[in-house]
Interface confidence: medium
Amino acid sequence: VLEVYYTSLRCRCVQESSVFIPRRFIDRIQILPRGNGCPRKEIIVWKKNKSIVCVDPQAEWIQRMMEVLRKRSSSTLPVPVFKRKIP
């Protein structure tokens, strides 16, 4: 399990993965802007199996996926049923 918590730079991601995660395994993607003590944008992925992965924002697959999701987006539909707890 990839750990996601405070570091000395106040980034949440201790390490980031570039490994492709199929969209069908993803529940939620949280975008954290850079700044406030962390020099980079962070992308945290909650998988349907409840595990949490930090994804390298430069990974081509996540950039492509974000573009596809952005183009087909609908705001505030439907209410999430999961609890986004870091284990």
């Epitope: 918590y5 405070y6 106040r10 949440r12 969209r23 069908r24 993803i26 529940d27 939620r28 993607i29 949280q30 975008i31 802007p33 850079r34 700044g35 406030n36 944008k41 974000m66 596809v68 999701l69 952005r70 087909r72 987006s73 609908s74 705001s75 505030t76 539909l77 439907p78 209410v79 999430p80 999961f82 609890k83 986004r84 707890k85 870091i86």
Partner: antibody, heavy 127, light 107 residues
Amino acid sequence: EVQLVESGGGLVLPGRSLKLSCAASGFTFSDYAMAWVRQAPKKGLEWVATVFYDGSDTFYRDSVKGRFTISRDNAKSTLYLQMDSLRSEDTATYYCAREGDYYSRHVYVGYNWFPHWGQGTLVTVSS
Amino acid sequence: DIRMTQSPASLSASLGETVNIECLTSEDINSELAWYQQKPGKFPQFLIYNANSLQDGVPSRFSGSGSGTQYSLKINSLQSEDVATYFCQQYNSYPLTFGSGTELEIK
């Protein structure tokens, strides 16, 4: 229906403290980051602070760092802003706001925009 | 901090007209921009996210466009209920920042 109701505003002397609350309903509070945004009289909007959905991380604008503390009680679905060492430039209407997300191809994407706002509570810092 | 320069500061237009509000950012924000409408004495209402995606329930006469450092909000066929102040907001980096607002009135 998402509802955010702020309370705790009022007139306070410079250097004193005040604690704002925001009661949330109509959504799973513990699933969302929350923020405070303020608006000085006849002025624009100014982001103040954000707290992560589980309370584990907080983000502040430089001018309030060390003076303001954002926190949340997920069991009570309530957001707080503890304001210490208040200054006249902190005079504003303080809005509680919920982070946004969009739903696309069975995936939720969470972002720092604000689709839901409370009605605001006015804080006046004056002697 | 990313600076948001909004123009014009105020705007007067006739009913049925098309109006444009501009928002320039001090650096590329990768279309991570939202627009809000605030009517006098009310809290802000969310209109657009990701520069051009319309929030559910917002009339289709509102549209957003732009990329890089230049963004705009367009209101087609201006209605009396559109009288408000409009703000842009970037969420590309902390601190999150807003434009100074554009006050729209009917001629």
